[in-house]
């Protein structure tokens, strides 16, 4: 299970991976 593009809704932005667009996002960052 590849979770490399998962973005936390409540965690630090430090963990955000730079993906090439919204199509690669799994959770909308709040």
């Amino acid at each position: 299970l590849d979770l490399s593009n998962v973005q936390s809704k409540c965690g630090s932005k430090d963990n955000i991976k730079h993906v090439p667009g919204g199509g690669s996002v799994q959770i909308v960052y709040k």
């Epitope: 973005q7 932005k13 955000i16 730079h18 090439p20 667009g21 919204g22 199509g23 996002v25």
Partner: antibody, heavy 120, light 112 residues
Amino acid sequence: QVQLVQSGAEVKKPGSSVKVSCKASGYTFSDYVISWVRQAPGQGLEWMGEIFPRSGSTYYNEKFKGRVTITADKSTSTAYMELSSLRSEDTAVYYCARDYYGTSFAMDYWGQGTLVTVSS
Amino acid sequence: DIVMSQSPLSLPVTPGEPASISCKSSQSLLNSRTRKNYLAWYLQKPGQSPQLLIYWASTRESGVPDRFTGSGSGTDFTLKISRVEAEDVGVYYCKQSFYLRTFGQGTKVEIK
């Protein structure tokens, strides 16, 4: 308030390079992507590429690959776009824009634009 | 590459009347996980930098008048202006950010 301030107009010779700067203020520079977009005279908008300052990771428009380099200096909150092997068709206004990365992926703040003229 | 096509390319309008711009993408811009369409609309007024109007296909940016409405999903999108005002003249661009970024050709809106 959020501001993106770009460097001044440039006149360049064909075959040379240009480096345009974009100084950000009013937000945490590392939290947003900076995109570069150009507009030739009387033409539409063309996305060139982007950088995520936190990691230095970049994506480029295939059209410009090998000719464009986008960098960022976190210590000064400044992004740079360098375009090499300039030709007359590169005459355009070059914009930097803050891209709301991770949510809308929309460019919510734009610089004032930098006119680059390529002429012999 | 995702190709964005706008129509019409030129739109003469009468103040107070509605206006509509179409934008079509060569592939779907809907992310089924986030349930968002990664489509934005921008207005570039004469002599100015572009400004964001709509993102996620239908969410109005803060400060944008409610006469601007974005709609659509997948590959077909529309920007509607309910009652055009003189200050709305300029070039309107749609832009996809599903994969990298691509702008439409632009639609020039001018007063008749």
